[in-house]
């Protein structure tokens, strides 16, 4: 199984759980319902996954194909600077806050958006597939 870090890179991914989409070397879950950012994070963690951490522009562009105008929560927060849930800084794209309450990040087909973490939105989880080894 994909053990150790939740944020590892996966190789030769065989399969994803039901209702998850395999894309590249990872499994992605696009929610149908809406939750606030914290509840979305809990949902992902309960399924051995994490709120979407995007590694580069290429992954972002690929994922945006599956998105609409509706914003989805991702694992991005502003804690003295925009950082992903794995601790890495956001460095391949821009996001700006229009008010002090906009401390969580969301994505739609057009790009990233800062939002209040309380807004109920769709969300995206990301995980390693079954029977896979993590690459560290």
């Amino acid at each position: 199984l994909c053990q150790g870090s939740n944020y590892s890179t996966c190789a030769s991914c065989p399969s994803c759980p039901d209702r998850w989409m395999k894309y590249g070397n990872h499994c992605y879950y696009f929610s149908v319902e809406e939750k606030d950012w914290n509840s979305s994070l809990e949902f992902c963690l309960a399924r051995d996954s994490h709120l979407l951490v995007i590694t580069d522009n290429q992954e972002m562009s690929l994922l945006q194909v599956f998105l609409s105008e509706a914003f989805c929560w991702i694992g991005l927060r502003n804690n003295s600077g925009w950082r992903w849930e794995d601790g890495s800084p956001l460095n391949f794209s821009r996001i700006s806050s229009n008010s002090f309450v906009q401390t969580c990040g969301a994505i739609n087909k057009n790009g990233l958006q800062a939002s209040s973490c309380e807004v109920p939105l769709h969300w995206v989880c990301k995980k390693c597939p079954f029977a896979d080894q993590a690459l560290f």
Partner: antibody, heavy 120, light 107 residues
């Protein structure tokens, strides 16, 4: 269409209390921060209070902290402003306002206002 | 607290003219500025956010500009419905402060 209707204004004695209400319709109330803004007789606009989506966070200018309390009832789609220890400077038209969405705290929609007059 | 200073306090102009209203912040507020229009006896109406982005339905003769501490709202080819008062507002942090307003009257 977004509709905000304020009520509860009127004449109140110096040091008295008053509770304003704002009935919201035409949008999903439980998705938005809500605020109160007032306009003085001199036509100056002053921000009064803002409440978060859950109601768990409330914000006030220092001059109104402790005297004013903003609250919301999402089941009733209603915003409230409880005002106490009122003084003559609180005489104003009080507007209920909705933010732009996603926590964009500009005042995208305004009600018609309710007049509060504080008299000796 | 951030103070917003609007100028002029009032101005007179004719239909078809172009006018510019200015708003100055006491410190750098980047682009976190909104503009509102208020007609006599009515509630304020939202015009612009982030200094230059027009709200939905606002005519293109309105344009906002500026960043940092100096901002302006320009109205090209004034129409009769444009007369009234205009207010700027800092929208990033608390307290949310408004300018004292500019009254635009028909000459």
């Amino acid at each position: 269409d977004v509709k905000l209707v304020e009520s509860g204004g009127g004449l109140v004695k110096l040091g008295g209390s008053l509770k304003l209400s704002c009935a919201a319709s035409g949008f999903t109330f439980s998705r938005y921060y809500m605020s109160w803004v007032r306009q003085t007789p001199e036509k100056r606009l002053e921000w009064v209070a803002t409440i978060s989506i859950s109601g768990g966070n409330t914000y006030y200018p220092d001059t109104m902290k402790g005297r004013f309390t903003i609250s919301r009832d999402s089941a009733k789609n209603t915003l409230y402003l409880q005002m106490s220890s009122l003084n003559s400077e609180d005489t104003a038209v009080y507007y209920c306002a909705r933010e732009g969405g996603y926590g964009n705290l500009w005042f995208a929609y305004w009600g018609q206002g309710t007049l509060v007059t504080v008299s000796a | 607290d951030i103070q917003m200073t609007q100028s002029p306090a009032s101005l007179s102009a004719s239909v078809g003219e172009t006018v510019t209203i200015t708003c100055r912040a006491s410190e750098n507020i980047y682009s976190c500025l909104a503009w509102y229009q208020q007609k006599q006896g009515k509630s304020p109406q939202f015009l612009v956010h982030n200094a230059k982005t027009l709200a939905e339905g606002v005519p293109s003769r309105f344009s906002g500009s500026g960043s940092g501490t100096l901002f302006s709202l320009k109205i090209n080819s004034l129409q009769p419905e444009d007369f009234g008062s205009y207010y700027c507002q800092y929208h990033y942090g608390i307290p949310f402060t408004f300018g004292s307003g500019t009254k635009l009257e028909i000459k």
